[in-house]
Amino acid sequence: MNSRRREPITLQDPEAKYPLPLIEKEKISHNTRRFRFGLPSPDHVLGLPVGNYVQLLAKIDNELVVRAYTPVSSDDDRGFVDLIIKIYFKNVHPQYPEGGKMTQYLENMKIGETIFFRGPRGRLFYHGPGNLGIRPDQTSEPKKTLADHLGMIAGGTGITPMLQLIRHITKDPSDRTRMSLIFANQTEEDILVRKELEEIARTHPDQFDLWYTLDRPPIGPWSAEGATLLSNSAQFH
C-alpha cells in the first residue's frame, strides 16, 4: 500500500478561480522574470497534469484579462508555483505601443498581492512512457496515442511547456521516450533556462537533442555543450 500522504491539490475545479499571492520575484534578464506564487498552504501542490497550463485572470482598466501560462515548477513542488514570463513593456515594439496588459500588470505586482489562477486547461496530457492523450477540443475525451520520439519547436518563453515535458520524461528512468527540441531566440543572451537544457542534453545524450536557432547569432566562436547552433532562423522558413 502507498503510505505517502496525498498532498492537497489547489486546482481541484478547472472552472474556479483561486487567488494566489506573489511571494517572490526574480529578474532573469532585462525583460524576463520568474514569479513565484504561494499555494493555499505549504503542503499544497498545484495539481497540473503534464501537458496542461494555467490561466491568470485580472481586472485591468475595467476589463477582465485572461492569459495562459505553463508553470516551470511541477507537482513535486509544494507550497508554490513558478512562472517564467517575458514582460512586454509599452513603447518598445512599434506595432504594440501599449505593451502587454497582463505582463505589465504582473511586473507591477508587489509581494503579497494576489492574482487569480484557473485550471487545469489544455488539450494535451502526458501519461507516462510515450503515452499521450490529445483532446480534439476542450470538451472531448482525450484520444490516446503512443510516441517513441517527440519533436518540439519553441520560441522564447514558449519553452515553458516543453520544459515541463522534458523535465517530466528525464526524471523518470523508466521513460525512454526520445525528444528533439529546436529552440528559437533572438540572441544568445535571450536563451531562457539555457543551463538546465544543456545539462539535460549532456546527461541524456541518447534521449534529448537540443538545437538552437538565433535571429542574431554571435560573431565569435559558439560554445554550448550538448547543443547545436543552427546558423539562423531562416533555415526553417
Epitope: 475545479d13 474556479a16 478561480k17 499571492p21 493555499p40 481586472k59 477582465l64 503579497g112 494576489t114
Partner: antibody, heavy 123, light 109 residues
Amino acid sequence: QLQLQESGPGLVKPSETLSLTCTVAGDSISRSNYYWAWIRQPPGKGLEWIGSIIHTGTTYHNPSLRSRGTILVDTSKNQFSLKLSSVTAADTGLYYCARHSGHDQLPLDFDNWGQGTLVTVSS
Amino acid sequence: ENVLTQSPGTLSLSPGERATLSCRASQRVNSNYLAWYQQKSGQAPRLLIYGASSRATGIPDRFSGSGSGTDFTLTISRLEPEDFAVYYCQQYGGSPLFTFGPGTKVDIK
C-alpha cells in the same frame, strides 16, 4: 432568490469553541464561481473578514485569526460552517455569512449576506 | 496589510443635499478591486458599488463611485431619507485578502 441563514449558539463561554453554520437556499453552494465567507462585526464597530471557502474545500483565512479559525463546507447539505476556538470577550459580535460571486467574473466583493447572528462570549 | 481610512467619521446632512464620502488606502489598490457597502441600523450590509465605479444590481443612480490608486470617493447626489446609514469601503488583494474601512456614518442634521 438566494438566501443565507446563520445558525448557532448565541452564548459561548471564554476559552471554548464558537460554532456557526450557514445554510444556503436558492442556489447551489457548488457553483465554481462562488466563494462563501464569514464576516464579523463587534458591537458598534466595523466589519472584519474572517475567511472564505469554495465548494472544493479550499479555504482562505484572515491571518489575524488563522490559527483559531476553521471553515468547512458540506455540499450535500448546501451549508458551510465556522469554528473559532479559544474565544474571548473580544470575539463577541454579529457574525454574518456572505457570498462573493464576483461581478465581472472575479469573486471580489460580497453581493449577498445573511441577516447575521449575535454571538456573546461570556461566562 | 493595506489599511483603509474613511473620512469623515460622521457626516451630518439634510435630505436633498449631496454627500461625499472618502476612502483612502495605505497602499495602491487596483481600482477594479474596490467596493462600497451601505449598512442600515439592525441590517446586514448591502453592496452598492463594485470595481470602484460600477453600481450593483438595483442600486439607484444617485449613488456613484470614483477614484483610483489610493483615493476613492462615494457620492450620493441627493440624499433620500432611506440613505441615512453607515457606509463602508472594502478592498480585495494582499493579506488579508479582504479589508474594510472603519465606516462613515451619514446622519440627519
